[in-house]
Amino acid sequence: EPPTACREKQYLINSQCCSLCQPGQKLVSDCTEFTETECLPCSESEFLDTWNRETRCHQHKYCDPNLGLQVQQKGTSETDTICTCEEGLHCTSESCESCVPHRSCLPGFGVKQIATGVSDTICEPCPVGFFSNVSSAFEKCRPWTSCETKDLVVQQAGTNKTDVVCGPQDRQR
């Protein structure tokens, strides 16, 4: 009797178990009692990345330079093009359809992780003993100056945004 379920890499149609098309190929005609499934390779600008019964291949993603995108990896008949962002920009989503400038860490915050083409800058608050007095996408929190090592004393305490101010020690009279 006609099958109700098919093996892996097959599909059921008209009571037939037909072979799926391999990645990189699209379906031209279903199998019959007397013939195999017929498949054709995707064209140069197209792909299919799974065993499939698609009658159309998918277009490769276009990395639009107007959106700050560039090609990270060229697509094949079996894989999509991978886009990344130009320097100074990162993707707005996992699918990387557009780019935005890396954010800068405000004063009082330092760069924990420098941005890449696919991830934004990660900032962290400067802990006690550290400061950042600039808005930057690259600079980490810097340690307060150690007055003691310069044989000086703290004249003005540091904050997360400012360094300590050192001064000479008072002379004993």
């Epitope: 005609s29 279903d30 019959t32 009692e33 007397f34 013939t35 195999e36």
Partner: antibody, heavy 112, light 112 residues
């Protein structure tokens, strides 16, 4: 249901061209399947002559030595057989078939 | 060409008894995908052939379950578990793995 019906002259003179048409109903010949011509000489077995595919491409039996042509008219959902330079040996019942469905067959006699 | 040899060429069976027909090919009928396109047909007296079994062992729709097909490679068998009067006619195997498609010479089944 799929139905196939052969039509054409029942008598052909030697050296002339045999022409038959198969009209298909219940299924488009451009959708899928291979559309075959098969013949059966009197008291003998079946011989595959060739097919035209759903996409219009062909395959023929080399034993017929380039005498056979299968074509189609998609607007009428028909496919046709032409067999040139016929002899008495081409006298047979001619069937058009999708293989799961067959026409009822038409007898062609080659005689002067 | 794949030459198809059927045995026996004739068979006389008592109703209710089993019958078996063999079809042997001169070359393997398994294709590169592991599929085997071997089919069985029955041609009843005065009728067109009708499909019984396709792809070695699949019964075509409407075919009684007393008909079964088996085999692989080059050796194939059609079995009728309990022959009935309506089963009389000529049984053909047909391979469509290789072009040209080729038929067995036929096995005539009669009722005792």
């Amino acid at each position: 249901e799929v139905q196939l019906q052969e039509s054409g002259p029942g008598l052909v003179k030697p050296s002339e061209t045999l022409s038959l048409t198969c009209t298909v109903s219940g299924y488009s010949i451009t959708s899928n399947y291979y559309w075959n011509w098969i013949r059966q000489p009197p008291g003998k077995g079946l011989e595959w002559m060739g097919y035209i595919r759903y996409d219009g491409s062909n395959n023929y039996n080399p034993s017929l030595k380039n005498r056979v042509t299968i074509s189609r008219d998609t607007s009428k959902n028909q496919f046709s057989l032409k067999l040139s330079s016929v002899t008495a040996a081409d006298t047979a019942v001619y069937y058009c078939a999708r293989l799961d469905y067959w026409g009822q067959g038409t007898t062609v006699t080659v005689s002067s | 060409d794949a030459v198809m040899t059927q045995t026996p060429l004739s068979l006389s069976v008592t109703p209710g008894q089993p019958a078996s027909i063999s079809c042997r090919s001169s070359q393997s009928l398994e294709n590169t995908n592991g599929n085997t396109f071997l089919n069985w047909f029955l041609q009843k007296p005065g009728q067109s052939p009708q499909l019984l079994i396709y792809r070695v062992s699949n019964r075509f729709s409407g075919v009684p379950d007393r008909f079964s097909g088996s085999g692989s490679g080059t050796d194939f068998t059609l079995k009728i578990s309990r022959v009935e009067a309506e089963d009389v006619g000529v049984y053909f195997c047909l391979q469509v793995t290789h072009v040209p498609f080729t038929f067995g010479q036929g096995t005539k089944l009669e009722i005792k």
